[in-house]
């Protein structure tokens, strides 16, 4: 059959039919909905509403929608030895108490079970001492704490601002550089918008308010105590001492009222650069310990929760395809929420349900898509992305054979600015196109497409009257399913215009101030920007899933490659003595490189004249396109990384957030001037070009003519 | 055989320009990426600036705003423009390929 002809309506119409039936009102109800009572991981509350998702998709008209249950380890405050931190006199009594909750918003008073502020996976302790503030704990910070003002933070209380960085780096920089215990908090310089008004007022954060989160460094592993493998009934589990990624110290999360209270006692050096002050009316002293007066005083954290292997429930529809059930297009968002998840992630969950109802309304009228859609909402995403990956794990190898590609769909805003997208250079010219066909929701571009919005307010740094597109880390559920398993992945979102603020996420992010009303009164009161982001989401699953020659463009790739391979070997280049002595050379890479290039322009001459009409030949294009993100996998994985596989692209080993391009030769050079054994090091550099060499070439060849 | 060979060093004063080029050959230069270091008297090798196979390009703080890099694919030449020159350019200026293959040096020397 033909692509037309499985489907019983022209493949125009049904694009159009499909965008069209997406309503900007369902997306309102269907978040008022999901974010009226918390939807904690492994609580009773989540798994009604896992239950009422799947009698509604049912509803929508889906196949079949199954849930998928695993045990992981997740991690709880105890509900009667409460989290603080304390200030303690001399004598060992506490003089000061930060909060044991943060006050509720207006309407909220009632709710139970809200969750308490915490850094879930902290360890139980109580450690005292000395407090150093260390700015955002970055790499570069403890750097410059330890190797220029020669502070040493061993057995210290470090304290240290939220942003830039994923929270579970901090800790794990914390950890290295021998502090006992960690303090988060959110300064107003990163969280408190300049003239708007703090929650229920506006969208910033009050003083009492405190972000959530786990403080994992998993890299890509799942439940900490099944890594590789499903949590299901007949798991072998690890022994907690043996989990991966949990942190050692404990950690505990606070506001910046608390946080005023600690930091205005703060002595010792004074803060290096203006960097390193935040906006509170505080000296920002690094410590260690409290000034003059207050020199005998010390901190103290009293940290009481606990890890429990918990059931969690994902959940599953299926939508055949009629042409290719054997290939899968999946659309996947987490349900799991902190508090209420008016933003995180119930904005995105939202969307994914008014995605499906307008695909089942479509199925109900006879239509079928060609290729097999998956929709799932992800359990436990809060807690290291554990629904996904063990679902991912449980199915890898049907995932590595027929995954075509895997959509995002996690917040739907984190702004209200512009369109943002993260994804594989397969997908850049399906986006380019698809954004060229949708109408801008933007004041001021009325009538205007939403590609020409995009590109003026945020434009490619390195192609005019293009938009950017930046590259995937991680910190969401696409992880496993693009550094692991290698298939092609994308997310979208409208964000902020703030790009200094790339990584600090929203004022009130993971704090019990993200509700329903927070997006109705002050990001999205129309919903239009909710609805634009359906279109974007909708739209790439519905090509991926329809067009008969899939919508991956190789020459992207090959583009991407040589900047990659340019930076990489920049970085090199400014070790001359050394890429000199050791005899360093990039030959094999951009050799590599341009090999790729070459053949995938042939490629793409050959996709231009192919007969489509013959099922095999377009059954083996297709599959040559499907399996180039496979490619890039190497089995093995990256050091000490074994689930980041992708060799062109992995979470940066210093802020998971954000993705870094070659990343084991980035890895090998990184601070390679301190390497006790440099013949050693730029051994390691050389076997890495090796890696990315040798995998680039291998890519390339699966798109050479078969025979 | 890959070779580099530079020319375009010379004496300059203070504040004064200089253009130094680099012919390859033995090698496919429209698909690398290529660098300028230099070595002052009695120093070690100093990164300048590379530019890449793709056009991008990188320079060390040291010299940002006043060398630019540049290639012309078509004629397999690298050039550095140095502009505004300071007694501390002073050097002997290496084209690069990477670590394992160098020209011989030009000397650029910066003096009133």
């Known amino acids: 059959k033909s692509s037309n002809e499985a489907t019983n309506i022209t493949p125009k119409h049904n694009m159009k039919a499909f965008l069209d039936e997406l309503k900007a009102e369902n997306i309102k109800k269907f978040l008022y909905n999901f974010t009226q009572i918390p939807h904690l991981a492994g609580t009773e509350q989540n798994f009604q509403l896992a239950k009422q998702i799947q009698s509604q998709w049912k509803e929508f008209g889906l196949d079949s929608v199954e849930l998928a249950h695993y045990d992981v380890l997740l991690s709880y405050p105890n509900k009667t030895h409460p989290n603080y931190i304390s200030i303690i006199n001399e004598d060992g009594n506490e003089i000061f108490n930060t909060s044991l909750f943060e006050p509720p918003p207006p309407g909220y008073e009632n709710v139970s079970d809200i969750v308490p502020p915490f850094s879930a996976f902290s360890p139980q302790g109580m450690p005292e001492g000395d407090l150093v503030y260390v700015n955002y704990a970055r790499t570069e910070d403890f750097f410059k704490l330890e190797r220029d003002m020669k502070i040493n933070c061993s057995g210290k209380i470090v304290i240290a601002r939220y942003g830039k960085v994923f929270r579970g780096n901090k800790v794990k920089n914390a950890q290295l550089a021998g502090a006992k215990g960690v303090i988060l908090y959110s300064d107003p310089a990163d969280y408190f918008a300049p003239g708007v008004k703090s929650y229920p007022d506006g969208w910033n954060l009050p003083g009492g308010g405190v972000q959530r989160g786990n403080i994992l460094n998993l890299n890509g592993a799942g439940d900490p105590l099944t890594p590789g493998y499903p949590a299901n009934e007949y798991a072998y589990r690890r022994g907690i001492a043996e989990a991966v990624g949990l942190p050692s110290i404990p950690v505990h999360p606070i506001g910046y009222y608390d946080a005023q209270k600690l930091l205005e006692k703060m002595g010792g050096s004074a803060p290096p650069d203006s960097s390193w002050r935040g906006s509170l009316k505080v000296p920002y002293n690094v410590g260690p310990g409290f000034t003059g007066n207050f020199s005998t005083q010390k901190v103290k954290m009293h940290i009481h929760s606990t890890n429990e292997v918990t059931r969690i429930y994902n959940v599953i529809g299926t939508l055949r395809g009629a042409v290719e059930p054997d290939r899968y297009v999946i659309l996947g968002g987490h349900r799991d929420s902190w508090v209420f998840g008016g933003i995180d992630p119930q904005s995105g969950a939202a969307v994914v349900h008014e995605i499906v109802r307008s695909f089942g309304t479509l199925k109900k009228e006879g239509w079928r898509p060609r290729r097999t859609i998956l929709f799932a909402s992800w359990d436990a995403e809060e807690f290291g992305l554990l629904g996904s990956t063990e679902w991912a794990e449980e199915n890898s190898r049907l995932l590595q054979e027929r995954g075509v590609a895997y959509i995002n769909a996690d917040s739907s805003i984190e702004g209200n600015y512009t369109l943002r997208v993260d994804c594989t250079p397969l997908m850049y010219s399906l986006v380019h196109n698809l954004t060229k066909e949708l109408k801008s929701p933007d004041e001021g571009f009325e009538g205007k497409s939403l590609y020409e919005s995009w590109t003026k307010k945020s434009p490619s740094p390195e192609f005019s009257g293009m938009p950017r597109i930046s590259k995937l880390g991680s910190g969401n559920d696409f992880e496993v399913f693009f550094q692991r398993l290698g298939i092609a992945s994308g997310r979208a979102r409208y964000t902020k215009n703030w790009e200094t603020n790339k990584f600090s996420g929203y004022p009130l992010y993971h704090s019990v101030y993200e509700t329903y009303e927070l997006v109705e009164k002050f990001y999205d009161p129309m919903f239009k920007y909710h609805l634009t982001v359906a279109q974007v989401r909708g739209g790439m699953v519905f090509e991926l899933a329809n067009s008969i020659v899939l919508p991956f463009d190789c020459r992207d790739y090959a583009v991407v490659l040589r900047k990659y391979a340019d930076k990489i070997y920049s970085i090199s280049m400014k070790h001359p003595q050394e890429m000199k002595t050791y005899s360093v050379s990039f030959d094999s890479l951009f050799s590599a490189v341009k090999n790729f290039t070459e053949i995938a322009s042939k490629f793409s001459e050959r996709l231009q004249d192919f007969d489509k009409s013959n099922p095999i030949v377009l059954r083996m294009m297709n599959d040559q396109l499907m399996f180039l993100e496979r490619a890039f996998i190497d089995p093995l994985g990256l050091p000490d990384r074994p689930f980041y596989r992708h060799v062109i692209y992995a979470p940066s080993s210093h802020n998971k957030y954000a993705g870094e391009s070659f990343p084991g030769i980035y890895d090998a050079l990184f601070d390679i001037e301190s390497k006790v054994d440099p013949s050693k090091a730029w051994g390691e550099v050389k076997r890495q070009i090796y890696v990315a060499a040798f995998t680039v070439q291998a890519a390339a060849e699966t798109l050479s003519e078969v025979a | 055989e890959v070779q580099l060979v530079e020319s375009g060093g010379g004496l300059v004063q203070p504040g004064g320009s200089l253009r130094l080029s680099c012919t390859v050959s033995?090698?496919?230069?429209?698909?690398?990426?290529v660098s300028w270091v230099r070595q002052a008297p009695g120093q070690g090798l100093e990164w300048v600036s590379a530019i890449g196979a793709g056009g991008g390009t990188y320079y060390a703080d040291s010299v940002k705003g006043r060398f630019t890099i540049s290639r012309d694919n078509s004629k397999n030449t690298l050039y550095l423009q140095m502009n505004s020159l300071r007694a501390e350019d002073t050097a002997v200026y290496y084209c690069a390929k990477d670590g394992a293959d160098w020209g011989q040096g030009t000397l650029v020397t910066v003096s009133s």
């Open positions: 033995g090698f496919t230069f429209s698909s690398y990426a």
